[in-house]
């Protein structure tokens, strides 16, 4: 029967070769900003605009910073402990069952519909009937004419923090 | 998809050796440590020893020290255990796994593992 090995007794044979700037962990964990060295005993922090960690871990490397695609416009950058926050662009959205691409709003609803809700980063515009007042799902049928409106203005940040 | 294959495994006398080999694939991260961990049967699974992919940072469990030697092949993905001078109590199913975290001596810190390979030592 072995003994019980703490950490301690497990002390590396060979040291990882210096990196960026460091501190030591409180209780085996980094603070968000960094990330473990591998033998445990150094917080590395992460570089500014390339990786980021938001909370206390003791993961071996911080989490790549997200790039905004094109039709996204960047509304802060990515920093340390906060990943880079992309909103789409102006008369597009994101759907949360298509989070991978903006897609462009509609740009009136259709006959017997009345716009209730403008285009946001993050919601197409949103249309009911007149009479019932049901919502309408689905796209604008080629063939029916539109009430047209100008895309509305985005009202907050839409992060794709992961 | 992650994917880990022991291999190696067998029958060897006390004082005989063994080498076991872990053949990685799936895997994308900027560092990771691949470990060794053993399982007797009635047991729990304990730690053998680990290695660090870009530092090379290496850890044995004080019963294994001196006997084993843990190394990695970069290009193949692969990690080996030369385990030498052989007693019944190393008598074990052997696991390989993963992990991206630091000074992982710890059977909870590890999110991957293979199927592991069986090392029988006796007379």
């Known amino acids: 029967e072995s003994a019980l090995i703490t950490q301690q007794d497990l002390a590396p044979q060979q040291r990882a070769a210096p990196q960026q700037k460091r501190s030591s962990p409180s209780e085996g964990l980094c603070p968000p900003g960094h990330h473990i060295s591998e033998d445990g005993r150094d917080c590395i922090s992460c570089k500014y605009g390339q990786d980021y960690s938001t909370h206390w871990n003791d993961l071996l490397f911080c989490l790549r910073c997200t790039r905004c695609d094109s039709g996204e416009v960047e509304l802060s950058p990515c920093t340390t402990t906060r990943n880079t926050v992309c909103q789409c662009e102006e008369g597009t959205f994101r759907e949360e069952d298509s989070p991978e691409m903006c897609r462009k709003c509609r740009t009136g609803c259709p006959r017997g519909m009345v716009k209730v809700g403008d285009c946001t980063p993050w919601s197409d515009i949103e249309c009911v009937h007149k009479e019932s007042g049901t919502k309408h799902s689905g796209e604008v049928p080629a063939v029916e004419e539109t009430v047209t409106s100008s895309p509305g203005t985005p009202a907050s940040p839409c992060s794709l923090s992961g | 998809e992650v994917q880990l294959l022991e291999s190696g495994g067998g029958e060897v006398q006390p004082g005989g050796s063994l080498r076991l080999s872990c053949a990685a694939s799936g895997l994308t991260f900027p560092n990771y440590g691949m470990g060794w961990f053993r399982q007797a049967p009635g047991k729990e699974r304990e730690f053998v020893s680990a290695i660090y992919w870009s530092g090379g940072t290496v850890y044995y469990a004080e019963s294994v020290k001196g006997r084993f030697t843990i190394s990695r092949d970069n290009a193949k993905n692969t990690v080996y255990l030369q385990m030498s001078s052989l007693r019944a109590e190393d008598t074990a199913v052997y696991y390989c796994?993963?992990?991206?975290?630091?000074?992982?001596?710890?059977?909870?810190?590890?999110?991957?593992w293979g199927q592991g390979t069986l090392v029988t030592v006796k007379p």
């Open positions: 796994a993963v992990t991206i975290r630091g000074a992982a001596t710890q059977t909870w810190k590890y999110d991957y």
